[in-house]
């Protein structure tokens, strides 16, 4: 005997109860795939969840955060807080970055500043809580009578401001 | 059915109090840290308060330390917010909502949060 049910498209399903009939899905339910025998509740995004694609016959609701929180894992199935530039999420609250750490982004942890002499560099600029260390030259390339790929500036006579 | 359900909230005068409950259902309380989080007339989502497991353990935001307390019943599988002192600047929607699995270790993320119950402060 064949399978009926295999002919039932996306939206419906297999109503075993009315001799394999194809069923539209009932309201806040949908099926994705064609030969289902029952259809899947939809995903109801409410409180900290906010509706970004309405549930159809054949797809799933899809959610999204509310402003002042940002999206975690698979199809945003949590919502998780943003902190501000400089500070790092902990489970008291948004918490500045450490001396020495810095976060550029609203999420993630504080990262340590670039340790510009491991590379045989030094700090061009200084890290803030918001912004990594810039490194610059190694402190050789800097140093009096180091070769330099730029030509010394002319030399000025002794009591004249640079203009 | 997961499913979580705020009461409580209503029309106070600064100065005054409130205690909102959050009654939780289709789930274990006692298994999940539990937060209370809000949202002002136009503003996003701000978070309020969180408690652990047990109630060992509770974190509040600078802006109610002091005025508010988040406590929990786990054998009535419920959770509550006494806020005291209100002001014009507490009022919002309060959302109870449930730390994700591996909440405290691996992120801060919330899975599930009821409607809200809307808290009004005025004269």
């Known amino acids: 005997l064949q399978d009926l049910c295999s002919n039932c498209p996306a939206g419906t399903f297999c109503d075993n109860n009315r001799s394999q009939i194809c069923s539209p899905c009932p309201p806040n339910s949908f099926s994705s795939a064609g030969g289902q025998r029952t259809c899947d509740i939809c995903r109801q995004c409410k409180g900290v969840f906010k509706t970004r694609k309405e549930c159809s016959s054949t797809s799933n609701a899809e959610c999204d955060c509310i402003s002042g929180y940002h999206c975690l894992g698979a199809e945003c199935s949590m919502c998780e807080q943003d902190c501000k530039q400089g500070q790092e999420l902990t489970k008291k609250g948004c918490k500045d970055c450490c001396f020495g750490t810095f976060n550029d982004q609203k999420r993630g942890i504080c990262r340590p500043w670039t340790n510009c002499s491991l590379d045989g560099k030094s700090v061009l600029v200084n890290g803030t809580k918001e912004r990594d260390v810039v490194c610059g030259p190694s402190p050789a390339d800097l140093s009096p009578g180091a070769s330099s790929a730029t030509p010394p500036a002319p030399a000025r006579e002794p009591g004249h401001s640079p203009q | 059915q997961v499913q979580l359900v705020e009461s409580g909230g209503g029309l106070v005068q600064p100065g005054g109090s409130l205690r909102l409950s959050c009654a939780a259902t289709?789930?274990?309380?006692?298994n999940y840290w539990m937060n209370w989080v809000r949202q002002a007339p136009g503003k996003g989502l701000e978070w309020?308060?969180?408690?652990?497991?047990?109630?060992?353990?509770?974190y509040y935001v600078d802006s109610v330390k002091g005025r508010f307390t988040i406590s929990r019943d786990n054998a009535k599988n419920s959770l509550y917010l006494q806020m005291s002192s209100l002001r014009a600047e507490d009022t919002a929607v309060y959302f109870c909502?449930?730390?994700?699995?591996?909440?405290?270790?691996?992120?801060?993320?919330?899975?599930?949060s009821g409607q809200g119950t809307t808290v009004t402060v005025s004269s």
């Open positions: 289709g789930f274990t309380l006692s």
């Open positions: 309020v308060a969180n408690i652990n497991q047990d109630g060992s353990e509770r």
């Open positions: 909502a449930r730390g994700g699995e591996g909440y405290g270790v691996d992120h801060y993320g919330l899975d599930v």
